[in-house]
């Protein structure tokens, strides 16, 4: 069995989580991919997913989550913009491959969002960014409802951080329309 590891990202409110999930492009280029949150004792919950089949470099936005799947590179980019403290939790990138269970990409992400002025408009990119605009044309894809039953029976992965996931529902999934995110200059 693959050992599940976690990568801790500590960011401030208003910043952007920017994760690159690599995959074998020959196998998974056009497969549908998703961003999920994992709460203790629950099955992973899909927050956003790419279209099926996944479109090359075409941004999909659900609330404050933006997915971009780069087929040519074997890379799924996940961004959560304007982070809030309640976004803290455990996340993962997965590839849907029905009828098989989803294939997990990358390390799981332990996101810790703290209050306080970030100093940058919304990035964890060390201020090297000089242009950052959310694309005006984004689509929202319909995500499959199933999740892997096996994931539930796994022991929760050990974390280097003692961070609890908030009990309150994250608003990211309660969005029915595409939300326009303010442009950062």
């Amino acid at each position: 069995a693959t050992k599940l590891t976690e990568e801790k990202y500590e960011l401030k409110e208003g910043q952007t989580l920017d994760v690159k999930c690599d995959y074998t492009l020959e196998k998974f280029a056009s497969s549908q991919k998703a961003w999920q949150i994992i709460r203790d004792g629950e099955m992973p919950k899909t927050l956003a997913c790419t279209e099926r089949p996944s479109k090359n470099s075409h941004p999909v936005q659900v609330g404050r989550i933006i997915l971009e799947d780069y087929h040519d590179h074997g890379l799924l980019r996940v961004r959560m913009v304007n982070l809030q403290v309640e976004d803290s939790g455990l996340y993962q990138c997965v590839i849907y491959q029905p009828p098989k269970e989803p294939h997990m990409l990358f390390d799981r992400i332990r996101l810790v969002v703290t209050k306080g002025f970030s100093g940058t408009p919304g990035s964890n990119e060390n201020s090297t960014q000089n242009v950052y605009k959310i694309p005006p044309t984004t689509t929202k894809a319909l995500c499959p409802l199933y999740t892997s039953p096996r994931t539930v029976t796994q022991a929760p992965p050990k974390s280097t951080a003692d961070v609890s996931t908030p009990d309150s529902e994250i608003n990211l999934t309660n969005v029915t329309d595409i939300i326009r995110v303010p442009v950062f200059n």
Epitope: D22, N56, H73, F106, N124, N126, V131
Partner: antibody, heavy 116, light 107 residues
Framework: EVQLVESGGGLVQPGGSLRLSCAAS????????MSWVRQAPGKGLDWVAS????????YYVDAVKGRFTISRDNAKNSLHLQMNSLRAEDTAVYYC?????????WGQGTLVTVSS | EIVMTQSPATLSVSPGERATLSCRAS??????LAWYQQKPGQAPRLLIY???IRATGIPARFSGSGSGTEFTLTISSLQSEDFAVYYC?????????FGGGTKVEIK
Amino acid sequence: EVQLVESGGGLVQPGGSLRLSCAASGFTFSSNWMSWVRQAPGKGLDWVASIKQDASEIYYVDAVKGRFTISRDNAKNSLHLQMNSLRAEDTAVYYCVRGGWRFESWGQGTLVTVSS
Amino acid sequence: EIVMTQSPATLSVSPGERATLSCRASQSVSSNLAWYQQKPGQAPRLLIYGASIRATGIPARFSGSGSGTEFTLTISSLQSEDFAVYYCQQYKNFPLTFGGGTKVEIK
């Protein structure tokens, strides 16, 4: 077959300017991030700048920020690097590369020499 | 800025032998690590991405491993065409940074 062909390199005096260009073919240019990576003679690789497909995101290494400008013309499948206020330490082979984070395809490079 | 450190600077290996190259990051880069090969007078070529995924057309003798801060590129049985300089690169955060390179030379 992916092809990236750089041009515009040459000898320039400190404080001068050069504009590098890259002609891309063999892939969907408008769907790809593009970057410039440089290599000083006998040295290692250094990332210079990256630009998203629609230029909505652009990143530079600190050493060139404010002096270099990366741009692209998707209609012409071309990538550019405008280099101003050049310094001796900018002397290098400049590679046009496909990708914004890691680099799948590389051109053969164009040599920029900054010397008086 | 994430600093990438490669070791050794030079590795002398006989053809057919195994070569193990190391790359260390000053802070965690998760699995966002790539390896490149560069031969004299040529542009670099992507070998490995995602720390362990072989790029298209790369022979199976090349393998990558590691996560976080410690990474390894292994060439299981060196062929004559494998003698070159190898670079690691992190792409977790901008600025993107490369290691200083490891030269694999014929013993």
